[in-house]
Interface confidence: medium
């Protein structure tokens, strides 16, 4: 029992020293590109960090396969409604995998935050939060998209963010 017990203790200690992959990315002035691509994120300043995950052009890149809790919140707001706004705004987390040519929907929400019928002077606020556990392989990527991104408010790194951690 003694040697087996000490072996288990050693394994536990080793596990506790292994760093679970985690990242929290925050909204920045450069997040909204207007190009139709995914949102871009701050990875280093303020509350943002990357640990055991990498980042590339808006995407969190998985380096270690496993189950991950992924999440994103976007703060929406405006004065009246932007011209050309679709009837709904889609906020989604999407997976890119080398095994498939198109992005795959992971978590998606739809909002109708500002009705065109209201007065154009109406200041409004809304938000969308997504979070869930998904399995990701090494090399796969997760991105955030918002259509219409013009409604995303970024003022500081606390309102709109994107992250993941291995569970």
């Amino acid at each position: 029992d003694g040697p087996a017990g000490s072996w288990e203790q050693l394994i536990q200690e080793r596990r506790s020293h292994e760093v679970n992959p985690a990242a929290h990315l925050t909204g920045a002035n450069s997040s909204l590109t207007g190009s139709g691509g995914p949102l871009l994120w701050e990875t280093q300043l303020g509350l943002a960090f990357l640990r055991g995950l990498s980042y590339h052009d808006g995407a969190l890149v998985v380096t270690k396969a496993g189950y991950y809790y992924i999440y994103s919140k976007v703060q929406l707001g405006g004065v009246g409604c932007p011209l050309g706004l679709a009837s709904t705004i889609t906020h989604g987390l999407y997976k890119r995998t080398p095994r498939y040519p198109e992005e795959l929907e992971l978590l998606v929400s739809q909002q109708s935050p500002c009705g065109r019928a209201t007065s154009s002077s109406r200041v409004w606020w809304d938000s969308s939060f997504l979070g869930g556990v998904v399995h990701l392989e090494a090399g796969e990527e997760v991105v955030v998209r918002v259509l219409d991104e013009r409604l995303v408010r970024l003022r500081d790194g606390t309102r709109s963010y994107f992250g993941a951690f291995m569970v």
């Epitope: 207007g34 707001g77 405006g78 004065v79 009246g80 932007p82 011209l83 050309g84 706004l85 679709a86 154009s120 002077s121 200041v123 013009r150 408010r153 003022r155």
Partner: antibody
Framework: QVQLVQSGAEVKKPGASVKVSCKAS????????VHWVRQAPGQGLEWMGA????????SYNQKFKGRATLTADKSTSTAYMELSSLRSEDTAVYYC??????????????WGQGTLVTVSS | DIVLTQSPDSLAVSLGERATINCKAS??????????MNWYQQKPGQPPKLLIY???NLESGIPDRFSGSGSGTDFTLTISSLQAEDVAVYYC?????????FGQGTKVEIK
């Protein structure tokens, strides 16, 4: 470079209609609003409305609603402003202008050269 | 509608001197830390030209002698050292709500 080229000067009789065109180049036409602003001789600037070429959505100054029609043709990257039931006080230079991508903070960063519309009997 | 009142209506300034134009809105044009006020320059026979957007941001290609400041209802356009080519009419414009409105204009001349 971004360019907005408007159609030529028009002389119209009271009660008639006029249609001014604004051909855009140098940017993605469907991603930016096109606004129309007029300026009577020796006077200030007056916003008439805007069109979003991506889906044809429009917003009008109530003063012109029912008399002005704003449209956009994606195939030719051209925006149009039609004003009906013309009266002498509609004599003005009519400008098209590109609005910024963010509508709520819509500043006009590129302007057409202007089209003089004269309404006279 | 939001009414913008500029002062003065006209301004004569010596070359190299500072010119200051004020614009007062009938209600606040602030939202989420931004002020939706813009400034344009118009020379005779030409369309207006964007100088400053969202109160204090200098449009690319505009000389840095132009600056904008203010928030809420009170805004200022400053030309730090007037040049001959700055002779024009200057307009403020709010984009907080439609109908977007302009001030009546301020004519800047050389003294």
């Amino acid at each position: 470079q971004v360019q907005l080229v408007q159609s030529g000067a028009e002389v119209k009789k009271p009660g008639a209609s006029v249609k001014v065109s604004c051909k855009a180049s140098g940017y993605t036409f469907t991603s930016y609003n096109v606004h129309w602003v007029r300026q009577a001789p020796g006077q200030g600037l007056e916003w008439m409305g805007a069109v979003y070429p991506g889906n044809g959505d429009t917003s009008y100054n109530q003063k012109f609603k029912g008399r002005a029609t704003l449209t956009a043709d994606k195939s030719t990257s051209t925006a149009y402003m039609e004003l009906s039931s013309l009266r002498s006080e509609d004599t003005a230079v009519y400008y098209c202008a590109r609005g910024s991508y963010y509508y709520t903070s819509s500043y006009f960063d590129h302007w057409g050269q202007g089209t003089l519309v004269t309404v006279s009997s | 509608d939001i009414v913008l009142t500029q002062s003065p209506d006209s301004l004569a300034v010596s070359l190299g001197e500072r010119a200051t134009i004020n614009c007062k809105a009938s209600q606040s044009v602030d939202f989420d830390g931004d002020s939706y006020m813009n400034w344009y320059q118009q020379k005779p026979g030409q369309p207006p030209k964007l100088l400053i957007y969202t109160a204090s941001n200098l449009e690319s290609g505009i000389p840095d002698r132009f600056s904008g400041s203010g928030s809420g209802t009170d805004f200022t356009l400053t030309i730090s050292s007037l040049q001959a080519e700055d002779v024009a009419v200057y307009y403020c414009q709010q984009s907080y709500e439609d109908p977007f409105t302009f001030g009546q204009g301020t004519k800047v001349e050389i003294k």
